[in-house]
């Protein structure tokens, strides 16, 4: 028969024949032959391979270095790598999460639109008219101006995006 030019899924072509790939969690020891199956070997502790493969070495589990603000979110297995995330108050600098930076704070005049997570930074938004923020914070949203009317008071000083309104007593003098 003609030697194959392509192989089925979970197989690879070598020496004009189709060999089975090694399953996740195992590495290749020797290719199959006309008479023998592919020989695979489990990855050891602290190693993994996450795909059907013909790798001769397993990969090392990632180290979540606490000196870089990292911690383990999920321990690796023979089929999965360790997943790192950042300590409280920090977030990853990249998708691979190789290091962490402190969450950004929103300056006065800005409020938190979305609180940071281990993988995304704080999202700030300017306080719209009627709202203010007088602190630099990674958690505080813009607060609405105090409603003087509901307290039977009047606005003595207008609010800004950084300050609340100042309420005062109603003027007793009536025309």
């Amino acid at each position: 028969p003609e030697p194959p030019t392509a192989c089925r899924e979970k197989q690879y072509l070598i020496n004009s024949q189709c060999c089975s790939l090694c399953q996740p969690g195992q590495k290749l020891v020797s290719d199959c032959t006309e008479f023998t199956e592919t020989e695979c070997l489990p990855c050891g502790e602290s190693e993994f391979l996450d795909t059907w493969n013909r790798e001769t070495h397993c990969h090392q589990h990632k180290y979540c270095d606490p000196n870089l603000g990292l911690r383990v979110q999920q321990k690796g297995t023979s089929e999965t790598d360790t997943i790192c995330t950042c300590e409280e108050g920090w977030h990853c600098t990249s998708e691979a999460c190789e290091s962490c930076v402190l969450h950004r704070s929103c300056s006065p005049g800005f409020g938190v639109k979305q609180i940071a997570t281990g993988v995304s930074d704080t999202i700030c938004e300017p306080c719209p008219v009627g709202f203010f923020s007088n602190v630099s914070s990674a958690f505080e949203k813009c607060h609405p101006w105090t409603s003087c009317e509901t307290k039977d008071l009047v606005v003595q000083q207008a609010g800004t995006n950084k300050t609340d309104v100042v309420c005062g007593p109603q003027d007793r003098l009536r025309a």
Epitope: V29, L41, E45
Partner: antibody, heavy 118, light 106 residues
Amino acid sequence: EVQLVQSGAEVKKPGATVKISCKVSGFNIKDYYIHWVKQRPGKGLEWMGRIDPEDGDTKYDPKFQGRVTMTADTSTDTAYMELSSLRSEDTAVYYCTTSYYVGTYGYWGQGTTVTVSS
Amino acid sequence: DIQMTQSPSSLSASVGDRVTITCSATSSVSYILWFQQKPGKAPKLLIYSTSNLASGVPARFSGSGSGTDFTLTISSLQPEDFATYYCQQRTFYPYTFGGGTKVEIK
């Protein structure tokens, strides 16, 4: 600084049970496997077993199976190894050690001496 | 169980010598670890994943091998290297150590 600090030396009678602790600091115990290793006086290292502190999963060497129990308390970052039905051959230094990661040392405790004597 | 056989069990060498220790497994393993132990002290990881130096280990130590046969080499023996060396496989339970190789001063 990463440390594994083990409990102090023990003297036990044959048939008794010993429980050794291994308190870790500088890392979260759930992030590593904790292995226990036995070393008799003047002899080599013997792997006894390991525990995954995260879920309590254990693997024991069959020659200790039935006599050894490994546990971990994640709230105090402490692993324990209990060995029962002690005999004279259990006189040894017992070490706790971690799985390794690239860039780490594969940490070890200082060892706990257990003497079994009538 | 996989047996790990180290040879020699002891050797005498001088400072500056090149020293080779072998570790043989009864079946193929993914990798081995090498440890150094000095009297009265806990073992110390020297090499992980067969050939990678652990943090802080001098470059005179190297590891090689695959499958069933592995080697630890000290290119130029230093006074602080006189110790006992152990290999360990962590592929199949129960994980097993070699019997150790004691490196003594000639």
